[in-house]
């Protein structure tokens, strides 16, 4: 039961995380105009991975896509790539994990196969979360660097425009969404990996049975046959549980609470 709960929770947490990664990638507020020096501006600038926007105090917003690929900074391209890789891995992970869920019966799929799929999806979620966190962190680092370097007539590297006015950009909402979403995906992946251990029927113990053949007094006592899971052997003797439930010497791991600044 605990394994099912851990697996289910890992799936849900990862699902929320990947939805957050997709949302962050699509958001326009990766960087927003720093209003510290000009809190009374009637024009507010903000930028995303795909386009830059200007919101006028009159309420009108104009967004322009970055219609160049070669003219964009390498760092921005790298962030885009990381986020897309994160989304793709996460999406595949979700697809795999749906079939791996213990509560879903698909033909006569063995627990070992489900364990394999659970681990695969878990690893995919972990990599997906790391990609998102890395992408957001690279962008944040780029912002911090540009923030202190930003001076009049300096090229800031967003959208390939030369700035003739000192406009400094600070962290936008998408960065925080990305960090949290990446963290959730990572936690979900870890939970899937933990659930995989409980799913794997690592050792099947058969009761010793005496077979008395006629004319022979030979007792046949088979040893404990190990069912190979493909995740490394475990020499510990474990009690047998129905339905691949958690064993006694496994510790349930809960996602730790993170504070995102």
């Amino acid at each position: 039961m605990a394994v099912t709960a851990c697996q289910g929770l890992g799936f849900v947490v990862s699902l929320i995380g990947i939805a957050g990664i997709i949302a962050a990638t699509c958001m326009d507020q990766w960087s927003t105009q720093d209003l510290y020096n000009n809190p009374v501006t009637a024009v507010f600038n903000y930028q995303g991975l795909w386009r830059s926007c200007v919101r006028e105090s009159s309420g009108f917003t104009e967004c322009r896509g970055y219609f160049t690929l070669l003219g964009l900074p390498a760092m921005l391209q790298a962030v885009r790539a990381l986020m897309i890789v994160g989304i793709v891995l996460g999406a595949i992970g979700l697809l795999v994990s749906i079939f791996a869920l213990k509560c879903i019966r698909i033909g006569s799929m063995e627990d070992s196969a489900k364990a394999n799929m659970t681990l695969t999806s878990g690893i995919m979620f972990i990599v997906s979360g790391l990609c998102a966190i890395a992408g957001v962190s690279v962008f944040a680092n780029m912002l911090v660097t540009n923030f202190w370097m930003s001076t009049a007539n300096m090229y800031t590297g967003m959208g390939g425009m030369v700035q003739t006015v000192q406009t400094r950009y600070t962290f936008g909402a998408a960065l925080f969404v990305g960090w949290v979403a990446g963290g959730l995906t990572l936690i979900g992946g870890v939970m899937m990996c933990i659930a995989c251990r409980g799913l794997a029927p690592e050792e099947t113990n058969y009761k010793a049975v005496s077979y008395h053949a006629s004319g022979h007094s030979v007792a046949y006592k088979p040893g404990g046959f190990k069912a190979s899971t493909g995740f490394g052997s475990n020499t510990k003797n474990k009690k047998i549980y129905d339905g691949g439930a958690r064993t006694e010497d496994e510790v349930q791991s809960y996602p730790s609470k993170h504070d995102y600044v």
Epitope: T41, V43, S52, V54, E56, S57, S58, M161
Partner: antibody, heavy 118, light 113 residues
Framework: QVQLVQSGAEVKKPGASVKVSCKAS????????MNWVKQAPGQGLEWIGQ????????KYNGNFKGRVTITADTSASTAYMELSSLRSEDTAVYFC???????????WGQGTLVTVSS | DIVMTQSPDSLAVSLGERATINCKSS????????????LTWYQQKPGQPPKLLIY???TRDSGVPDRFSGSGSGTDFTLTISSLQAEDVAVYYC?????????FGGGTKVEIK
């Protein structure tokens, strides 16, 4: 078509208050900021403040803050500008104007002359 | 606050001739995000409210004759009437639309010589 119709001329004594109205028609009143602009006789234009009727959000020019209150009644599609503690230098024509793309004033009321005299 | 300075205070031009009004702001009105200058021009005829002519320094409002054109960037702007007509006699104002408080120039009175 868009129209802004202001209330009639007012004569007030120093220290009194005046409330000028601006009735809008021909557009979604709640969706555009309404501005108030002062023009003293023979002088230039001076922005007083603005209101977003949709949520009542206001912005004021510091020169008028504390003495001016801008309000709006969405059901009547009318904006109001109340100026208190009137002085002789408040004698002017007050215009309401709709805020538009480019942060410009695309439609203006006909103006309301407020005369402050003892 | 951004100070808008217009020159000249008044201008007398012959009919059909070019009229040029200058406007200088104390701070740049160029927004780096969209490379647009947040400067507006208005025309005010006697006894009437101002009328929008040009926004974003060079974009004519609908219905404004093409003899009116705006140019400039950053802190220096110009309104040009390529061929002055009798109905163009008015006071012209520039306005900072970039930072609060929204401020206007002192105005330039255009007359016929």
């Amino acid at each position: 078509q868009v129209q802004l119709v202001q209330s009639g001329a007012e004569v007030k004594k120093p220290g009194a208050s005046v409330k000028v109205s601006c009735k809008a028609s021909g557009y979604a009143f709640s969706n555009y900021w309404m501005n108030w602009v002062k023009q003293a006789p023979g002088q230039g234009l001076e922005w007083i403040g603005q209101i977003y009727p949709g949520n009542g959000d206001t912005k004021y020019n510091g020169n008028f803050k504390g003495r001016v209150t801008i309000t709006a009644d969405t059901s009547a599609s009318t904006a109001y500008m109340e100026l208190s503690s009137l002085r002789s230098e408040d004698t002017a024509v007050y215009f309401c104007a709709r805020y538009y793309r480019g942060n410009c004033f695309d439609y203006w009321g006909q103006g309301t002359l407020v005369t402050v005299s003892s | 606050d951004i100070v808008m300075t217009q020159s000249p205070d008044s201008l007398a031009v012959s009919l059909g001739e070019r009229a040029t009004i200058n406007c200088k702001s104390s701070q740049s009105l160029l927004n780096s995000g969209n490379q647009k200058n947040y400067l507006t021009w208005y025309q005010q005829k006697p006894g009437q409210p101002p009328k929008l002519l040009i926004y974003w320094a060079s974009t004519r409002d609908s219905g404004v004759p093409d003899r009116f054109s705006g140019s400039g960037s950053g802190t220096d702007f110009t309104l040009t009437i390529s061929s002055l007509q009798a109905e163009d006699v008015a006071v012209y104002y520039c306005q900072n639309a970039y930072t609060y408080p929204l401020t206007f120039g002192g105005g330039t009175k255009v007359e016929i010589k």
